[in-house]
Each structure stands twice: as structure tokens, then as C-alpha cells.
Interface confidence: medium
């Protein structure tokens, strides 16, 4: 599984490693894999989540490179809580099949966190 390292408090784009077809307009979803379950990331259904490689006014698509990261999950101001394994799923609009890929995020250099700190929100961009 590919691994991405980021310094604490930096932003990161997690790439979707699913073997996408450039001509299929997938919809992407992200989950963080947890012990005993999954946590679904926020993925608002906007143009930039669509894999049909439009690139209007900064909207991203998989066929073009949105910051060289197709279907990337943008995590801002990372903390140690963000470390872990993430899975992207690309849904074929015709329902024929879903494609998925995993990526490991390691956030380094974070100070010790207080227990009451909660997970940051995520947004795919």
C-alpha cells in the first residue's frame, strides 16, 4: 500500500490509487479504515469529485491532474489523528463495477495531543 508522509499541521492531498479509466465519469468516496469499522469522509458531490476530467475554473477531475493528484482527498492542518489507512472508492455511473485503492497517511512531528481533542473534518477536493 502506498504511503504518504506529511509534517504535522501541513495540508496533504491523498491520491486515489484505484486503477481508474480516464473515460468513465466515476464518483469518488473516501473512508478511513478504523479498527472494527470505517469512518466516511465528507465528500460533497461537486464537479471536482467527478472523474470526467473537466477542469473549469479550478474544478478538478481525474483525467487532468488536480495538483497531480487524481480524485485526491484534501486534508487540511493535519494532526496525529489523521494518521492511518484510507480507502478511496470510484463508483462507475453505469453500476458495472467499483474500483478502490488504499493509501497510508503518516503525520509526523505532532506534539502529544490531549485526549479530548477530536478528529478534524475532511473534504475531498
Amino acid at each position: 500500500t502506498p504511503e504518504v508522509k506529511v509534517a504535522c499541521s501541513e495540508d496533504v492531498d491523498l491520491p486515489c490509487t484505484a486503477p481508474w479509466d480516464p473515460q468513465v465519469p466515476y464518483t469518488v468516496s473516501w473512508v478511513k479504515l478504523l479498527e472494527g469499522g470505517e469512518e466516511r469522509m465528507e465528500t460533497p458531490q461537486e464537479d471536482h469529485l467527478r472523474g470526467q476530467h473537466y477542469h473549469q475554473k479550478g474544478q478538478n477531475g481525474s483525467f487532468d491532474a488536480p495538483n497531480e493528484r487524481p480524485y485526491s482527498l484534501k486534508i487540511r492542518n493535519t494532526t496525529s489523528c489523521n494518521s492511518g489507512t484510507y480507502r478511496c472508492t470510484l463508483q462507475d455511473p453505469d453500476g458495472q463495477r467499483n474500483l478502490s485503492g488504499k493509501v497510508i497517511l503518516r503525520v509526523t512531528g505532532c506534539p502529544a495531543q490531549r485526549k479530548e481533542e477530536t478528529f478534524k473534518k475532511y473534504r475531498a477536493e
Partner: antibody, heavy 115, light 109 residues
């Protein structure tokens, strides 16, 4: 100025090969998917092939599968279409175009397949 | 993708409209409809006018407008000018593979 300049068109015999080129300028070529679209004489537009921004993913129309190969050289800002086993019905003006929305087009290059 | 009419004689200064019909809905699961319009003037390369049904590309005169939903779409020219003569194509990018309409030839009466 954003521009796609094409070259490589020619008159060739059936069964022969030809390589078309599309040189990009005025934008960051390596971050855009690219397409080839063709237009037979007096006919409409027909999508041919596409390649993702990094060249890792390619797709072809059924009528060219196994005969045509799309590729790109990002350091050279150039898109290619290698056409093998050419047939008379491949005769057309071939256009390169930028990204899925086909927002920028080349000037076209004419391929004539004739014996 | 079926366009009509295939030939459209027009009077300069008068409105004109072109229809494009898809055999299946072009509404994508993300809620967007990926239907584009292109203009091809005689002897020139195609040029995109409208993307996603109704969005004009930069530099496209506001006399061009697009509308429609689902399977039926229309390109309208509010007042035809001489430079508008040419062939107009619709193209869908919702479903694989990318497909074009047959083209509508706009010519002066």
C-alpha cells in the same frame, strides 16, 4: 497563448503506418488529459482516443483498438497518435484537443489513406 | 446523439435554434449534465461554445445560449450574424464513450 500545433499528416497506402504529433504551448501540458478527434471528408466529428495527464491511462474508440496508439511526452509537451494498419476509412482530418471538455483544439492535420 | 434540423437556413438578425436529443439521460450521478456545444466555421477547427448545458466559454458572444435537461437540449442564437455560419455539434460527456451529434449546418437563406 494557449495553442496546439499539429503535424504528421500525409497520404499513405492502405496497411501502412503514420504518426501524428500535437505540440502544446501556453499551458501546463503535463496536467491535462488529451484527446484525438477525427472528421472524415464531409462528415461529422468522431472521438478517437484519449490519454490521461501522466500517460498512464489510455482509451480508444472500438474502430481503432489494436491499430492506433495514443501517447505523450510531457517533457516535450507533445501528444502523439501512432496509426498502424491504416484503412481507406481512416481518411480524415485528425484533431488533438485538450481535456475532457475539448476546450482547446489543434488546427487539424489531414490523413489520406489511398492506394 | 441526434441533432435537428441537420440544415438550418437563417436570416441575418433573426433568432435560430438547434435541438440535440440523447437516447439516454445525460444527468450524471453527481447532479451535473455534461452536454457541450461546438461551432465549426468553414475551413476551421471546432471551437467549444457551451459546456455543461448552459455555460458559455470565455470569448463567446452572449447571443449564444444553451438550455435543456435530461435528454433534450437546445442551442439558441438570439440574432444570427454572418460570422455564425458553420456547423454546430452537440457532444455528451456523461457516458462513455464520448459521442457527438451529426451536426447542424447553419447557412444564410
Amino acid at each position: 497563448e494557449v495553442q496546439l500545433v499539429q503535424s504528421g499528416g500525409a497520404v499513405v497506402q492502405p496497411g501502412r503506418s503514420l504518426r501524428l504529433s500535437c505540440a502544446a504551448s501556453g499551458f501546463t501540458f503535463s496536467t491535462y488529459g488529451m484527446h484525438w478527434v477525427r472528421q472524415a471528408p464531409g462528415k461529422g466529428l468522431e472521438w478517437v482516443a484519449a490519454v490521461s495527464y501522466d500517460g498512464s491511462n489510455k482509451y480508444y474508440a472500438d474502430f481503432v483498438k489494436g491499430r492506433f496508439t495514443i501517447s505523450r511526452d510531457n517533457p516535450k509537451n507533445t501528444l502523439y497518435l501512432q496509426m498502424n494498419s491504416l484503412r481507406a476509412d481512416d481518411t480524415a482530418v485528425y484533431y488533438c484537443a485538450r481535456r475532457g471538455g475539448l476546450d482547446i483544439w489543434g488546427q487539424g492535420t489531414t490523413v489520406t489513406v489511398s492506394s | 446523439m441526434t441533432q435537428s434540423p441537420l440544415s438550418l437556413p437563417v436570416t441575418l438578425g433573426q433568432p435560430a435554434s438547434i435541438s440535440c436529443r440523447s437516447s439516454q439521460s445525460l444527468i450524471h450521478s453527481d447532479g451535473n449534465t455534461y452536454l457541450d456545444w461546438f461551432q465549426q466555421r468553414p475551413g476551421q477547427s471546432p471551437r467549444r461554445l457551451i459546456y455543461k448545458v448552459s455555460n458559455r466559454d470565455s470569448g463567446v458572444p452572449d447571443r449564444f445560449s444553451g438550455s435543456g435537461s435530461g435528454t433534450d437540449f437546445t442551442l439558441r442564437i438570439s440574432r444570427v450574424e454572418a460570422e455564425d455560419i458553420g456547423v454546430y455539434y452537440c457532444m455528451q460527456a456523461t457516458h462513455w464513450p464520448r459521442t457527438f451529434g451529426q451536426g447542424t449546418k447553419v447557412e444564410i437563406k
